[in-house]
């Protein structure tokens, strides 16, 4: 059945800027988005923006920009003015309608530092891009490996050299390791029936937003398709819920906001799938 | 408190339309969808179509091939359901609906209008 | 269009029982919605999006199902459960309704 995951996410670079997140699982071409704040729209919440696949987007303060990242996805920027950050403790509500089948909304909030069940407050977390973190490593094992045979040289001048191997270990992959299975207690904490696949992939490359979310097939005309098999839900990043349709919160564990440019994580090996079979495309 | 007034009751000929309204009330009117459906005497449900309040935009069941007309006002908070071209089967109680949304974590609530009866009798 | 076929037709049951009705779509459908309807009332949404239920509806109700076949089912009967019960889909236009299961009581 339809879901809708709604992800909030604090900017690396100033912390006064804040992106939502949202997207939406299910048959059917989407014919409206509505993002609100402060609770669901049309139940107290108060819209920031509204995007329509043909006409455009309209946006209120404090939204700054609101854009389709993918036929199924939205993205909204909020620029918080003040001095202290209200948007820290604020729900936000994404609200997908697929006309006339029926509307599905799901909220999210960005998780206080405080929460037990996170490990580090919503900063910037410095992950190193895997060709950097291999010239790194490579780099730190030939300073290394000069620093050892100068060494070995002084003390021994007539010892032969010693071999070395650059290690290329991936920074990201070993993230990600430490990362999923926290994902799936979380998952167990929220909800008893969720099943999460913590099995380790590896990063897809090339297939992603600089932003870090995956980039999936757009078309231009609308096509609608019946109905297929449920797609596997992306791991989404920091404070992401997903929205399932037994009324409880899963959330979806926890991921540094920037992984870097390239670099799309997924609870299979498989990718995104089933994208163009399941949603009738802009 | 949300509420959706119906007009009253009807009596028509075979051939002729009949116009029911809907005003809504309680809530944002363009916020929710309404849908109609009727319920002949004794009978089951039929769901006659939807409308997006928002932008007008209409899906019909086909059964009625272009014979029903959703219309709305947001002026006055009103939609609107024609039915042209009225036969005796057309008699029944007709309803309109504010169409539910699903939102996690949140009440899913339905509302109805109280029902409009077309009687079509020559 | 989807066809919804309900059974039985007539439930007879005593208040404490427990009542299932069953609603076979004619091709598969991604989710049932079920509403309970009172003589001289209009319908009330009861379960949407095949096991949710909506806001107010006691928890002795409860939905299951998938593809082709859906259920509903009372847990114990109060005296204010008999009444009429439609399944509806909405996966295909044009929407439909089950023909409907009368609960009454024995």
């Known amino acids: 059945t339809p879901e809708v995951w709604v992800q909030v996410q604090m900017e690396a670079t100033e912390l006064s800027s804040f992106t939502v997140h949202c997207g939406f699982l299910g048959p059917g071409s989407i014919s409206l988005v509505t993002v609100s704040w402060g609770g669901p729209d049309g139940a107290g919440g108060t819209k920031l923006a509204v995007l329509h696949p043909e006409l455009g987007t309209r946006q209120w303060a404090p939204a700054r920009q609101a854009r389709w990242e993918t036929q199924s996805s939205i993205s909204l920027a909020l620029e918080d003015s003040g001095a202290s950050s209200p948007f820290a403790n604020t729900t936000f509500c994404c609200k997908f309608a697929s006309f006339p089948e029926g509307s599905w909304e799901s909220c999210g909030s960005l998780p206080p530092s405080s929460d037990p069940g996170l490990s580090a407050p919503p900063t910037p977390v410095p992950i190193l891009r895997a060709d950097l973190a291999g010239i790194l490593g490579l780099s730190g094992v030939l300073l290394f490996g000069c620093g050892y045979l100068l060494h070995l040289l002084r003390r021994q001048k007539h010892r032969p050299t010693p071999r070395l191997q650059p290690s290329h270990t991936n920074s990201q992959a070993l993230t990600a390791q430490a990362w999923a299975p926290s994902q799936a207690s979380q998952a167990a904490l929220h909800d008893p029936y969720a099943t999460i696949n913590t099995s380790f992939c590896p990063a897809t490359l090339d297939t992603a937003h600089p932003n870090g979310w995956a980039s999936l097939p757009t078309h231009a005309a609308h096509q609608p398709q019946g109905p297929a098999a449920s797609a596997s839900t992306p791991i989404l990043a920091r404070g992401s819920f997903v929205s399932v349709e037994n009324g409880l919160y899963t959330q979806a564990g926890e991921r540094p906001p920037h992984t870097g440019p390239g670099l799309t994580l997924f609870p299979d090996c498989r990718g995104p799938r089933a994208v163009e079979g399941r949603f009738g495309v802009r | 408190e949300v509420q959706l007034v119906q007009s009253g009751a009807e009596v028509k000929k075979p051939g002729a339309s009949v116009k029911v309204s809907c005003k809504a009330s309680g809530y944002t009117f363009t916020d929710y969808w309404i849908y109609w459906v009727r319920q002949a005497p004794g009978q089951g449900l039929e769901w006659m179509g939807t409308i997006d309040t928002s932008d007008h935009k209409t899906s019909y069941n086909q059964k009625f091939r272009g014979r029903v007309t959703m219309t709305r006002d947001t002026s006055t908070s009103t939609v609107y359901m024609e039915l042209s071209s009225l036969r005796s089967e057309d008699t029944a109680v007709y309803y309109c609906a504010r169409d539910f949304i699903i939102t996690v974590n949140y009440p899913v609530v339905d509302y109805w209008g109280q029902g409009t009866l077309v009687t079509v009798s020559s | 269009q989807i066809v919804l076929t309900q059974s039985p037709a007539t439930l007879s049951l005593s208040p404490g029982e427990r009542a299932t009705l069953s609603c076979s779509a004619g091709s598969s459908v991604n989710y049932m919605h079920w509403f309970q309807q009172k003589p001289g009332q209009a319908p009330r949404l009861l379960i949407y999006s095949t096991s949710n239920l909506a806001s107010g509806v006691p928890a002795r109700f409860s939905g299951s199902g998938s593809g082709t076949d859906y259920t509903l089912t009372i847990s114990s009967l109060e005296p204010e459960d008999f009444a009429v019960y439609y399944c509806?889909?909405?996966?295909?236009?044009?929407?439909?309704f089950g023909q409907g299961t009368k609960l009454e009581i024995k």
């Open positions: 509806q889909q909405r996966s295909s236009l044009p929407f439909t």
